[in-house]
């Protein structure tokens, strides 16, 4: 038994036929010693007398609000809730399995940007006697603060014969660092109480993995002279992180009729305009995704083709984002070739995802603690890799990126990746390895040597352990190169001489 909140206790029960249950001793919160009686819920039947009451809790009939009285006066209450465990698994009767992105997904969370603000939601078919409370933190062993509001009923839907209720909650990390590479996941804990049943649900994620931008805004069409083509332009959504030269999006533009089966024109672009072929009765749709990290695509923003009247061209805000404040010289050399670094770091992002695209769909934290990759270097808040830090002095950040590149380059060339099980011959790990080396050489000024971080001895003996470690390293590398790519994109746009 444990205390959920003041005067509310949860009794954990192994739930099987003829289970012995749990013996619980309740103590009346009073200085009185004599003449105390106990009742349960609305019943006037006296269950026992004295300052303590010992009960055997086996089923829901034994749970409820126990009240101690003296001479018709209520002294205190203790509400007992039951938490069922069947075959070693805690019950999940209250919430509905959303089955996306995998089975046993009860809580789903999304963030519109990197500000540390996110929304979680869950579904239930229960309409009454239901309460939720939500707690969250960054990390669990030394938790950092995340503040969550109250869970509210956000939608009701009819599904067949049943009504489905959606609840949601908004949370905000207390001291978020949008530009940093997350090393500890956000933990979300939801306590659910239905009548006398208690259940708890948890979710663990990095903000980067739950990013889903809002749709692009202000779609405009401009027909091109003497052509079937139309120039479509749009802008970054207002809710997306700024500056856009750092937090860049990529876009998918599609022209399609009302039916998904109809023919279509489709093009991907990093710009905020594109030229497509419009057809009568078709619509042009645009959606957005983080340019450097493969999180979710936004919903589509759409405009009908027939509306392609004379409106202005694209003035999207994905451009440079400011003047060209010059980079302070790195000791032993000049500023890096920002544009070359940008191109190579973007290539690294692509390679890191193609090296293991499905890594994102594996919950690797099930196989170990949250610090599975705490040995790898992370770009942290104080490393100066945010837009302001880069403007002040990019040297600190570039040194950190260089250290990370060397570290990962050595890891990819180590026994972890060269040992059994052999990598598939078509694995892009080789290209990734070469590109890491290429970028680190581009970054290392001539005749100057930054100190590099010691590679930990991470050589597991079992092939399955090696496989798991590869996944974790690649997953971590995806996050690292995304931050590096943002740094170089921003540098190329704002710091290049």
């Amino acid at each position: 038994i444990w205390e959920l909140k003041k005067d509310v206790y949860v009794v954990e029960l192994d739930w099987y036929p003829d289970a012995p249950g749990e013996m619980v001793v309740l103590t009346c919160d009073t200085p009185e010693e004599d003449g105390i009686t106990w009742t349960l819920d609305q019943s006037s039947e006296v269950l026992g007398s004295g300052k303590t009451l010992t009960i055997q809790v086996k089923e829901f009939g034994d749970a409820g609000q126990y009240t101690c009285h003296k001479g018709g006066e209520v002294l205190s209450h203790s509400l007992l809730l039951l938490h069922k465990k069947e075959d070693g698994i805690w019950s999940t009767d209250i919430l509905k399995d959303q089955k996306e992105p995998k089975n046993k997904t009860f809580l789903r969370c999304e963030a519109k940007n990197y500000s540390g603000r996110f929304t979680c939601w869950w579904l239930t078919t229960i309409s009454t006697d239901l309460t939720f409370s939500v707690k969250s933190s960054r990390g669990s062993s030394d938790p950092q603060g995340v503040t969550c509001g109250a869970a509210t009923l956000s939608a009701e839907r009819v599904r067949g014969d049943n009504k489905e209720y959606e609840y949601s909650v908004e949370c905000q990390e207390d001291s978020a660092c949008p530009a940093a590479e997350e090393s500890l996941p956000i933990e979300v804990m939801v306590d659910a109480v239905h009548k006398l049943k208690y259940e708890n649900y948890t979710s663990s994620f990095f903000i980067r993995d739950i990013i889903k931008p809002d749709p692009p805004k202000n779609l405009q069409l401009k027909p091109l002279k003497n052509s079937r083509q139309v120039e479509v332009s749009w802008e970054y959504p207002d809710t997306w992180s700024t500056p856009h030269s750092y937090f860049s999006l990529t876009f998918c533009v599609q022209v399609q009729g009302k039916s998904k089966a109809e023919k279509k024109d489709r093009v991907f672009t990093d710009k905020t305009s594109a030229t497509v072929i419009c057809r009568k009765n078709a619509s042009i749709s645009v959606r957005a995704q983080d340019r450097y990290y493969s999180s979710s695509w936004s919903e589509w923003a759409s405009v009908p083709c027939s509306g392609s009247g004379s409106s202005r061209g694209g003035s999207g805000s994905g451009g440079s984002g400011g003047g060209g404040s010059k980079l302070r010289a790195v000791p032993g050399g000049s500023s890096p070739a920002w544009t070359q670094c940008q191109q190579l770091s973007q290539k690294l992002c692509t390679l890191a995802w193609s090296a293991h695209p499905l890594v994102g769909h594996m919950d690797l934290r099930e196989e170990g603690d949250e610090e599975t990759t705490n040995d790898v270097p992370h770009i942290q808040c104080g490393d100066g890799c945010d837009p302001q830090g880069l403007r002040d002095n990019s040297q600190f950040c570039l040194q950190r990126i260089h250290q990370g590149l060397i570290f990962y380059e050595k890891l990819l060339g180590s026994d972890i990746f060269t040992g059994e099980p052999s990598l598939l011959p078509d694995s892009p790990v080789g290209q990734l390895h070469a590109s890491l080396l290429g970028l680190s050489q581009l970054l290392q000024p001539e005749g100057h040597h930054w100190e590099t971080q010691q590679i930990p001895s991470l050589s597991p003996s079992q092939p399955w352990q090696r496989l798991l470690l590869r996944f974790k390293i690649l997953r971590s590398l995806q996050a690292f190169v995304a931050v590096a790519a943002r740094v170089f994109a921003h540098g190329a746009a704002t710091l290049s001489p």
């Epitope: 022209v255 024109d265 093009v267 030229t275 072929i277 057809r279």
Partner: antibody
Framework: QVQLVQSGAEVKKPGASVKVSCKAS????????LHWVRQAPGQGLEWMGW????????EYAPKFQGRVTMTTDTSTSTAYMELRSLRSDDTAVYYC???????????WGQGTMVTVSS | EIVMTQSPATLSVSPGERATLSCRAS??????LHWYQQKPGQAPRLLIY???QSISGIPARFSGSGSGTEFTLTISSLQSEDFAVYYC?????????FGGGTKVEIK
């Protein structure tokens, strides 16, 4: 399954015109875009243009603008590509291809060899 | 127009070995890049679309990667039926253009 069957080989004199046909089957003709791509002997692929059989809309590569006409006959599910003012360097295999996506080529015809020779 | 450059022009590989084909665009084309295989006397066939998306019915040994200006087609373990010419094609803007092709031949 989706299939494209093209007309037979042609031999033409310089300055003449050629009209190659491409009969589609296995799908609703107006549901796919139709492209024409050519390949000179021992050379690479060259895109000529596309037509939307639903409305007759066309887009031609600048190189062929004014010299090529693409048409369709929805009653027979057939597409046509006419190339005028033929020159010897128009000697090539001409392919029609179809796709629901406009910008790449999924289903190809078997090709029609057009030889331009005096 | 966007110029597509493929390298090498010819690649000599032994059966069972891995082949890596490159395609470079004259300007950034995001992931608007597709790969085709053509055997002598046959029409080309689509292998990969939008840089890395696989086609049903195409063996898993064919994979694509890249974005921007540099793209790669990898054939993990060459089979006898894979010796052919491979073309890349950009769909970023009209006119649609192809690379000059890479001939993969038996070493």
């Amino acid at each position: 399954q989706v299939q494209l069957v093209q007309s037979g080989a042609e031999v033409k004199k310089p300055g003449a015109s050629v009209k190659v046909s491409c009969k589609a089957s296995g799908y609703t003709f107006t549901d796919y875009y139709l492209h024409w791509v050519r390949q000179a002997p021992g050379q690479g692929l060259e895109w000529m243009g596309w037509i939307d059989p639903e409305n007759g809309d066309t887009e031609y590569a600048p190189k062929f603008q004014g010299r090529v006409t693409m048409t369709t006959d929805t009653s027979t599910s057939t597409a046509y590509m006419e190339l005028r003012s033929l020159r010897s360097d128009d000697t090539a295999v001409y392919y029609c291809n179809a796709n629901k996506e406009l910008r790449y080529f999924d289903v190809w015809g078997q090709g029609t060899m057009v030889t331009v020779s005096s | 127009e966007i110029v597509m450059t493929q390298s090498p022009a010819t690649l000599s590989v032994s059966p069972g070995e891995r082949a890596t084909l490159s395609c470079r665009a004259s300007q950034s084309i995001s992931i608007n890049l597709h790969w085709y295989q053509q055997k002598p006397g046959q029409a080309p066939r689509l292998l990969i679309y939008f840089a890395s998306q696989s086609i049903s019915g195409i063996p898993a040994r064919f994979s694509g990667s890249g974005s921007g200006t540099e793209f790669t087609l990898t054939i993990s373990s060459l089979q006898s039926e894979d010796f052919a010419v491979y073309y890349c094609q950009q769909s970023n803007s009209f006119p649609l253009t192809f690379g000059g092709g890479t001939k993969v031949e038996i070493k």
